[in-house]
């Protein structure tokens, strides 16, 4: 008949498993339960994947690995005797009197329950990495954490190379024994110990469970250190940078930590496993029964086969590791799980020209001298698209791309952003908002949804803010509906008249030139250069100002560049910015200063794109450490990451305007990085490329 082979990871667990198997057999529970001995949870997962075992109970981190690497699925979950059901919450606690937030943890003193423990280490460290707050180079998480905090107590870190920093706050027992031990000898060990570390002022933040503060304050704790503590003197750090009362853990936490769950192969019937265990718990989970499923006392251990605190086992409806873990915990695990042994020794950068090869070579040498990991190798390609092909084919690893190329890299080649560029506010030509400007006119006000039949002013055919984005957006929103991919005709029929300067006017609809005025002599009408007075962003705005058009599609800076005395030309000298408004996608109008909230799209900063299986945190970790040394254009370290003047080129490897590389944070896909509006505009235009 059918049998289920449970995988045990130790002799005591094998002993308990044997007793459970025997108890189930005597009770006539089917299918029969057998026990297989593995050497560790990891080994058991491999045995299950290899069909040499069938089931094991795992914690969240192991469920993530088992699901991601071996395709196992969770089918039965543990429920603990507490109100939060199949999970608990990892929180960061601070003293109410402090000014610490999640964004200012760098340099503060930290208290952890223990090395590699879920709420004390895995979740907070994973979250800080995944959110971009903590950069890790070369998978050396311990070094990154020891550099990040201003001293810590991480019980169990004494054996590591960074014990000076990671054990600095630990104190051992009353006689000074067991300092930094992962055991009760260290007074700051475990949930209550980490909280004590905070309460006694050794640390500034404690990473504990949602219930820890309430269990150790307001007279609920027996030890003298906690008797006078009040829960109201502590607060939780929220992910959005705010703080909350310690009772608000459902809303304010680092992650919901999933309960342990039984995992099996994808082809195993989860219902069968639950029915087996459910029969078992019905008979063997209460006091006095011959076998105790949820107790390990008889074996001199804790948490054998199941956690001792389990009150019941429940079936898991959505049997995927992602659904069980939840996005918060999943994200934290992504940030944490970085295996130095599986980290490629090189990051192969795609280069497109001789000057770029030279700069990349210098970058590789400079990084190597500073022992930055992984090392850079430079690989040539013919074009951005060729880079994408080579990255997809695993011949190259990374390349910096512009918005349109990011779209292609993501959509066609499946690449994802690993890091982005950030420019100073003065560098608006590198990343800007596309806006629709109108005159402030209370009597004839119209919205973005009412543009049909209006007169439009565009910088020029094919200009991003003047044509591609606004026309793409209007197509995507269904206002402009090209027939047979004839965008020009569709636009000419949508607007009453327009000025869209163009270089090659062959077969160009006349209404797209109807508002153009040419030069002072009336010649060169609608030409795609400055001889046409309504050419370019300044010209498109002038077209609006002089009442030729009703709406101008320009950059967010255009109105400011030509009002309030910023342009002394006669047509602009007396203009005031407050006489103009923006049309917003939601149908509203807004002040021109509200461009960040009211725009058709943002032309995004460039981003470093990689394959989805590349660890983006190691890429950013490398770039972040590198920019500390080489990011400042005036650095004395022998290489300038964001300057190309030594190579007789521009924007080599990175845009010269970059002031720093930034983590992608939550923008982990090409769509996330580009923004929905920009993607919609590109899709609107690309839908017409027949």
């Amino acid at each position: 008949g059918m049998e289920v082979r449970w995988c045990a990871t130790s002799d005591p667990e094998q002993h308990k498993c044997g007793n459970m198997s025997e108890a189930f057999r005597e009770a006539g529970i089917q299918p029969s339960l057998l026990c297989v001995r593995g050497t560790s949870a990891d080994h058991c997962v491999q045995l299950i994947a290899a069909q040499e075992a069938d089931a094991i109970t795992l914690d969240g981190g192991a469920i993530y690995e088992a699901g991601k690497e071996h395709g196992l699925k969770p089918v039965v979950g543990e429920v603990y005797d507490q109100e939060v059901g199949t999970s608990y919450y990892a929180v960061a606690v601070v003293r109410r009197s402090s000014h610490v937030t999640i964004d200012t943890l760098k340099g503060v003193k930290s208290c952890h329950t223990g090395i590699n423990r879920t709420v004390g280490w895995n979740v907070p460290v994973g979250y800080l990495v995944e959110s971009g707050r903590l950069s890790v180079m070369g998978c050396d998480v311990l070094k990154a954490v020891s550099d990040y905090f201003g001293g810590s107590c991480v019980p169990g870190a004494g054996e590591t190379s960074y014990s000076e920093s990671l054990c600095r706050l630990c104190r051992g027992d009353s006689s000074g024994e067991g300092v930094c031990d992962k055991s009760p000898l260290e007074r700051y060990y475990d949930y209550s110990g980490a909280f004590r570390c905070l309460a006694e002022g050794a640390g500034d933040v404690a990473f504990v469970k949602h219930s820890t503060v309430l269990e150790n304050t307001d007279g609920k704790t027996l030890p003298s250190w906690g008797q006078a503590l009040l829960s109201q003197d502590f607060e939780l750090l929220c992910r959005d940078g705010s703080r909350a009362d310690v009772t608000e853990w459902r809303q304010c936490h680092l992650a919901r930590v999933p309960a342990h769950a039984v995992v099996v192969r994808a082809d195993t019937d989860g219902g069968l496993i639950f029915r087996l265990l459910n029969e078992g718990q019905r008979l063997f989970s209460h006091e006095g029964s011959s076998f105790q499923m949820f107790s390990s006392e008889a074996y001199g251990q804790k948490d054998l086969l199941f956690k001792d605190s389990t009150s019941e086992l429940v079936p898991i409806a959505t049997q995927t590791y992602e659904a069980w873990l939840g996005h918060e915990y999943l994200h934290a695990m992504k940030g944490l799980l970085c295996d130095p042994n599986r980290l490629p020794p090189y990051l192969r950068w795609c280069v497109l020209s001789t000057p770029e090869i030279q700069k990349c070579g210098d970058m590789a040498v400079a990084f190597r001298r500073q022992r930055l990991k992984p090392e850079i190798q430079c690989v040539s390609a013919k074009s951005p698209q060729h880079c994408m092909e080579r990255i997809q084919a695993e011949q190259v690893d990374a390349v910096t791309l512009s918005g349109e190329d990011i779209y292609t890299a993501g959509k066609t080649y499946g690449l994802v952003p690993a890091a982005g560029e950030h420019y100073a506010p003065e560098d608006s030509s590198n990343s800007y908002y596309v806006v629709a400007v109108v005159r402030r006119d209370s009597s004839h006000a119209f919205t973005l949804d009412e543009l049909r039949g209006k007169r439009s002013c565009h910088a020029g055919f094919g200009s991003p803010a003047g044509w591609d984005v606004p026309v793409g957006a209007l197509i995507q929103r269904g206002f402009i509906r090209p027939k047979d991919c004839d965008v020009l005709t569709a636009v000419s029929e949508f607007f009453n008249a327009s000025c869209v300067p163009v270089n090659n006017p062959k077969n160009y609809p006349s209404s797209l030139c109807a508002l153009c005025v040419g030069d002072e002599q009336g010649r060169n009408k609608c030409v795609g250069n400055s001889q046409e007075r309504y050419y370019g962003y300044r010209g498109a705005f002038r077209c609006l100002v002089e009442n030729a058009g009703d709406v101008a599609f320009v950059r967010h800076t255009t109105v400011f560049d030509n009002t309030n005395g910023h342009n002394s030309e006669p047509w602009a000298a007396e203009l005031r910015s407050e006489d103009y408004e923006l049309l917003c996608p939601n149908g509203a109008r807004a002040e021109v200063s509200q461009f960040a909230a009211c725009n058709l799209a943002q032309i995004p900063p460039h981003a470093v794109m990689v394959r989805p299986d590349t660890n983006i945190f190691t890429v950013y970790g490398l770039l972040d450490k590198a920019q500390d040394l080489f990011g400042d254009d005036h650095n004395k370290n022998g290489f300038k990451m964001f300057d190309s003047s030594n190579y007789h080129g521009q924007d080599l490897l990175f845009k010269d305007a970059t002031v720093r590389a930034v983590p992608v944070g939550e923008k982990t896909t090409y769509r996330g990085w580009l923004g929905l509006d920009y993607v919609a505009a590109l899709e609107g235009m690309s839908s017409q490329q027949c």
């Epitope: 950030h422 100073a424 506010p425 003065e426 560098d427 608006s428 030509s429 967010h556 800076t557 400011f560 560049d561 309030n564 910023h566 910015s577 200063s593 509200q594 461009f595 960040a596 909230a597 254009d633 305007a657 002031v659 930034v662």
Partner: antibody, heavy 119, light 112 residues
Framework: QVQLQESGPGLVKPSETLSLTCTVS????????WNWIRQPPGKGLEYIGY???????YYNPSLKSRVTISRDTSKNQYSLKLSSVTAADTAVYYC?????????????WGQGTLVTVSS | DFVMTQSPLSLPVTLGQPASISCRAS???????????LQWYQQRPGQSPRLLIY???NRFSGVPDRFSGSGSGTDFTLKISRVEAEDVGVYYC?????????FGQGTKLEIK
């Protein structure tokens, strides 16, 4: 009318962390760039860094290893932390706004708060 | 960093007379977008700095028209057409064409 107000301890011990908060009224810190500048007694102005409308930070390379600027949008506040301070960090600390309307000049400043580093 | 050098460092002026302060940048302040990000600030005794001029020559709102700015590239000038008693203080030029923004050493204007 845009107003900025710095707050925080006026005395910090050497090697400790200086923490200041800037409370903004009359504008939202989710638009524009929000800056910290300092001025040692009797000396000139030194730029410390900014936090952008989207929460991205930039720090003057001369101070980068010791500076953190963060924000709390719910309170319309942003903060400065400067770690491992020495007597050379004694200065009046100003918060200031930069927006496109004045081409990212610092158009509104707080009144400044004097921070003395001394044991 | 871009170095901003002001002259003179001290400027005694008679009330009602004009005053001129010069500022020189170590490199051109013309940005790729064509704008020149050069500002002038006034700091009266015991007060915080106050924006006077931005983008070389644009007066900030509320600034009297006796203040004017001019210049291009690396050389810039702040002029006060007729000095008044309330103009006493230190004047700083500043650039933000390249990060980090930098300031001149300041010019102290006093009444003779």
């Amino acid at each position: 009318q845009v107003q900025l107000q710095e707050s925080g301890p006026g005395l910090v011990k050497p090697s400790e962390t200086l923490s200041l908060t800037c409370t903004v009224s009359g504008d939202s810190i989710t638009s524009g760039y929000w800056n910290w500048i300092r001025q040692p007694p009797g000396k000139g102005l030194e730029y410390i860094g900014y936090i952008s409308d989207s929460g991205i930070t930039y720090y003057n390379p001369s101070l980068k290893s010791r500076v953190t600027i963060s924000r709390d949008t719910s309170k319309n506040q942003y903060s400065l932390k400067l770690s491992s301070v020495t007597a050379a960090d004694t200065a009046v600390y100003y918060c200031a706004r930069r927006t496109l309307a004045t081409y990212y000049a610092m158009d509104y400043w707080g009144q400044g708060t004097l921070v003395t580093v001394s044991s | 960093d871009f170095v901003m050098t002001q002259s003179p460092l001290s400027l005694p002026v008679t009330l009602g007379q004009p005053a001129s302060i010069s500022c020189r940048a170590s490199q051109s302040l013309v940005q790729s977008d064509g704008n020149t990000y050069l500002q002038w600030y006034q700091q009266r005794p015991g007060q915080s700095p106050r924006l006077l001029i931005y983008r070389v020559s644009n007066r900030f709102s509320g600034v009297p028209d006796r203040f004017s700015g001019s210049g291009s590239g690396t050389d810039f000038t702040l002029k006060i057409s007729r000095v008044e008693a309330e103009d006493v203080g230190v004047y700083y030029c500043s650039q933000s064409t390249q990060v980090p923004p930098t300031f001149g050493q300041g010019t102290k204007l006093e009444i003779k």
